[in-house]
Interface confidence: low
């Protein structure tokens, strides 16, 4: 019946609106309802205009699909013509009253089936059921796998490919490690895989600026070093450098009124020349302070060197040697005065003798037949040298003496001329000023070393060489080399160093052979007012340690390689250094900073006297040590 109605409507439409022209009311009579009429009539007018001898070309475009007016008008009521549905997504189109219904294929949705359903985003079937990649396609979807995986037969799940088993030579000399979806060519730490050569190559960490100051690369790693000689040490991160810090402040106050006699390791500290009337006689008065037992206080001579007078210290007592055309004499006497106290000393030439007084009390009188120095042309010309000789005079001396003297003088009056401009000279030269307070001991300022040549070979000992070291230390900085043996090839076969500990306010003692730490005594409180006593005994078979907290013997089994290196070095030439290292490579030892603080050293039963060193940095004090700084210090 419905189709019958449709046919009737079609006939009426042809008659009313194609064979004739119809207005909207006439069209209403055809359709008998408003929605269809309202839909039809505007489109009908477009068809009319379109086929009115092609005048309205703009409107015509939308009717180009129809060959004539009849087909154009007849198509208007059919909502499915032209097809409103998306051709890819629709299955069928159903015409309705001024409406249509598109039925969609699976995987499509929307009024016109224009929207693809994204199965990958379906909340009821997460990721479309794919285990890895879900690829949505128009009207469908499919699963795929990431690189390094293969799809299983269910077309949804993926399985890892084991590339290492698949191609055993994948990584060359490196180790192949399978990982999900991929593989890695693994190299030991410090090596980097080279794709071209399929091998592990050493990483030059030094070229990657890993270290703050100095860097040494080696296969599989690198070591950072800091310039200890400039006061740096390696920080805990083992890369950056930090300044070696003071752990025990010292009172380094000096006074220019006090003349320091050991400013030079070898040489005169002050030279004066006097030209006085011929009636003048030699005289010298001064206060003197030292802990040193031997050395030259002053040496006076005539212009032509023919007559001379030596005032020195030997065994802690004043010694006078003199020589002129009449006589040559040597006398030692008085109390021991190397007690660290100020002692007033005077040496005065009288008419027939030379009088030596300590604290204004005569301790020696030396007879002399004539004047000590002979005047010439009505003038007495005399040269006076403090703390040394002007040239090699050993052969002229009545009894040889080591001239080096660590001491101070003050309140001097030479040739009865008072201080006569000397203070002004000294005032400008800081290194000629003496410390206000000192204690017994040797002081290493952290800027130099002392060198000794010691024979460690003991012919009577079956062990061959042996090193027995006793150190009494009071460090001022927590890092530095205390003692080192250096071979002629610039290696350091044995060193005893101090290193700031990882634990707060304590130090470690490190014993090293070349650049290897063979023993570390950890967390000792060495930066204190009290001196610490350390003993080491080393021979080719073992190392014995004695510290305030530990007594231990480490046998050869544990140290075999290192003791063998040391044994080989000890059979050759080694120099002994105190307070630091000479110019050896930074990588030669684990520590290269200078030691700063007080230290007395006994090696194989002999107390080392820094005045006897082969060489010594001028700033090292052989027989005086600054006091510990006190907050309420009196200068």
């Amino acid at each position: 019946a419905n189709s019958m109605l449709e046919e009737t409507k079609q006939g009426n439409l042809e008659r009313e609106c194609i064979e004739e022209l119809c207005n909207k009311e006439e069209a209403r009579e055809v359709f008998e309802n408003d929605p269809e009429t309202d839909y039809f009539y505007p489109k009908y007018l477009v068809c009319l205009r379109s086929f009115q001898s092609g005048l309205f070309t703009a409107a015509r475009q939308s009717t180009d699909a129809y060959p004539d007016l009849r087909s154009c008008v007849n198509a208007i009521p059919d909502q499915c013509s032209p097809l409103p549905c998306n051709e890819d997504g629709y299955m069928s189109c159903k015409d309705g009253k001024a409406s249509f219904t598109c039925t969609c294929k699976p995987g499509w949705q929307g009024e016109k089936c224009e929207f693809d359903i994204n199965e990958c985003k379906d909340p009821s079937n997460i990721n479309g059921g794919c285990s890895q990649i879900c690829d949505n396609t128009p009207g469908s979807y499919h699963c795929s796998c990431k690189s390094g995986f293969v799809m299983l037969s269910n077309k949804k799940d993926c399985k890892d490919v084991d590339e290492c088993s698949l191609k055993p030579n994948m990584c060359g000399t490196a180790v192949c490690k399978n990982i999900p979806g991929d593989f890695e060519c693994e190299c030991p730490e410090g090596y980097r895989y080279n794709l071209k050569s399929k091998s592990c190559e050493d990483v030059d960490e030094c070229s990657e600026n890993m270290c703050a100051q100095l860097c040494v690369n080696y296969p599989g790693g690198y070591t950072c070093y800091c310039d200890g000689k400039k006061g740096f040490k390696l920080a805990q991160d083992q890369k950056s450098c930090e300044a070696v810090s003071v752990c025990l402040p010292l009172n380094l106050d000096t006074k220019y009124e006090l003349l320091y006699l050991a400013e030079q390791f070898a040489g005169v500290v002050l030279y004066l020349k006097f030209r006085l009337p011929e009636i003048s006689r030699f005289s010298a008065e001064f206060d003197f302070r030292t802990y040193d037992s031997q050395g030259v206080i002053l040496y006076a001579e005539s212009i032509d060197h023919s007559a001379w007078l030596l005032i020195a210290l030997r065994g802690g007592k004043i010694e006078v040697q003199l020589k002129n055309e009449h006589t040559s004499k040597i006398t030692t006497g008085g109390d021991i005065i190397n007690n660290g106290l100020w002692n007033m000393v005077s040496v005065e030439e009288l008419e027939h003798s030379i009088s030596i007084k300590i604290a204004k009390e005569a301790v020696m009188d030396i007879n002399k037949p004539g004047p000590l120095f002979k005047p010439e042309n009505g003038l007495l010309e005399t040269k006076v040298y403090f703390a040394g000789f002007p040239r090699k005079v050993e052969s002229e001396l009545i009894k040889p003496i080591n001239p080096r003297l660590d001491g101070c003088i003050r309140s001097w009056n030479l040739m009865k001329q008072g201080a006569s401009g000397i203070k002004e000279i000294i005032q400008e030269k800081q290194n000629k000023h003496c410390l206000v307070t000192v204690e017994k001991g040797s002081y290493y300022p952290g800027s130099g070393i002392a060198e000794f040549h010691i024979d460690y070979n003991n012919g009577s000992n079956a062990e061959g060489w042996h090193i027995n070291v006793t150190l009494n230390i009071r460090p001022s900085m927590g890092t530095g080399v205390m003692l080192a043996l250096v071979s002629s090839n610039n290696t350091v076969p044995f060193a005893v160093s101090l290193v700031d500990s990882t634990s707060e306010k304590s130090q470690d003692i490190v014993i090293s052979v070349e650049n290897t730490v063979i023993y570390r005594i950890q967390a000792l409180s060495l930066c204190s007012n009290q001196r610490s006593h350390l003993e080491f005994r080393v021979n080719r078979n073992n190392l014995e340690l004695l510290t305030p907290l530990k007594i231990e013997t480490i046998s050869q089994e544990e140290l075999q390689t290192q003791l063998a290196i040391l044994d080989k070095a000890m059979k050759g030439k080694v120099a002994t250094y105190l307070g630091g290292l000479p110019d050896v490579p930074f990588s030669a030892t684990p520590v290269n900073a200078f030691y700063n603080g007080c230290m007395e050293v006994n090696i194989n039963g002999v107390e080392l006297d820094l005045d006897e060193a082969i060489s010594k940095h001028n700033d090292i004090r052989a027989h005086s040590c600054p006091s510990v700084w006190k907050k309420t210090k009196n200068s």
Epitope: R192, E208, A212, A243
Partner: antibody, heavy 120, light 110 residues
Framework: QVQLQESGPGLVKPSQTLSLTCTVS??????????WSWIRQYPGKGLDWIGY???????YYNPSLKSRVTISVGTSQNQFSLKLISVTAADTAVYYC????????????WGQGTLVTVSS | QSALTQPASVSGSPGQSITISCTGT?????????VSWYQHHPGKAPKLMIY???SRPSGVSNRFSGSKSGNTASLTISGLQAEDEADYYC??????????FGGGARLTVL
């Protein structure tokens, strides 16, 4: 003689990304011993180190810029690049690329510099 | 504000010597020997003049010398010449593994 040449837009809008490239000629960017650096100079003449990269990809950045800066290397074109995100007017400067010696923090070759203005 | 402090300007007559100071802290200038100086003629590329406190790259005149005392580094130019007129920047490595520059000193040759 090594030469460096900066290139990139001279004007960038605030909040956008500043991108510059440095082309190296007369030497290979993959040579051992050099880091490739970016430095900028503010209008008031102060220099500010931005960061540098080693050809292996290791980067070192100024901590004050770390969250905004990326330096990358293109070894095939012998170039390295700077990206600075979320720029403000304070990022207006002459940007220099330079070669840094690995043996010390010294810049031995510099580009001529390129002025980048951040303005809307 | 630059991390290292330099005078804004210095001047000298031809033939004279001048010194430019660069003050930092113990964490940069005072803590390392990695101090350098750059000469910058406006519109040109900066040029490395001194490195490692006092070393000169090849090609740099020996009229330029560097030194350091405590936390302060100095650049001295002797026998001043007209072509020395430029901006001079000091630079130092820092404890936090970064590089800092001075604010720059303008040298005027009178």
């Amino acid at each position: 003689q090594v030469q460096l040449q900066e290139s990139g837009p001279g004007l960038v809008k605030p909040s956008q990304t500043l991108s510059l490239t440095c082309t190296v000629s007369g030497g290979s960017i993959t040579s051992d011993g050099y880091h490739w650096s970016w430095i900028r100079q503010y209008p008031g003449k102060g220099l500010d180190w931005i960061g540098y990269i080693y050809y292996t990809g290791n980067t070192y950045y100024n901590p004050s810029l770390k969250s905004r800066v990326t330096i990358s290397v293109g070894t095939s074109q012998n170039q390295f690049s700077l990206k600075l995100i979320s720029v403000t007017a304070a990022d207006t400067a002459v940007y220099y690329c330079a070669r840094r010696l690995s043996t010390g923090p010294y810049f031995d070759y510099w580009g001529q510099g390129t002025l980048v203005t951040v303005s809307s | 504000q630059s991390a290292l402090t330099q005078p804004a300007s210095v001047s000298g007559s031809p033939g004279q010597s001048i010194t430019i100071s660069c003050t930092g802290t113990s964490s940069d200038v005072g803590g390392y020997e990695f101090v350098s100086w750059y000469q910058h003629h406006p519109g040109k590329a900066p040029k490395l003049m001194i490195y490692d406190v006092s070393s000169r790259p090849s090609g740099v005149s020996n009229r330029f010398s560097g030194s350091k005392s405590g936390n302060t580094a100095s650049l001295t130019i002797s026998g001043l010449q007209a072509e020395d007129e430029a901006d001079y920047y000091c630079s130092s490595y820092t404890r936090s593994s970064t590089v800092v520059f001075g604010g720059g000193a303008r040298l005027t040759v009178l």
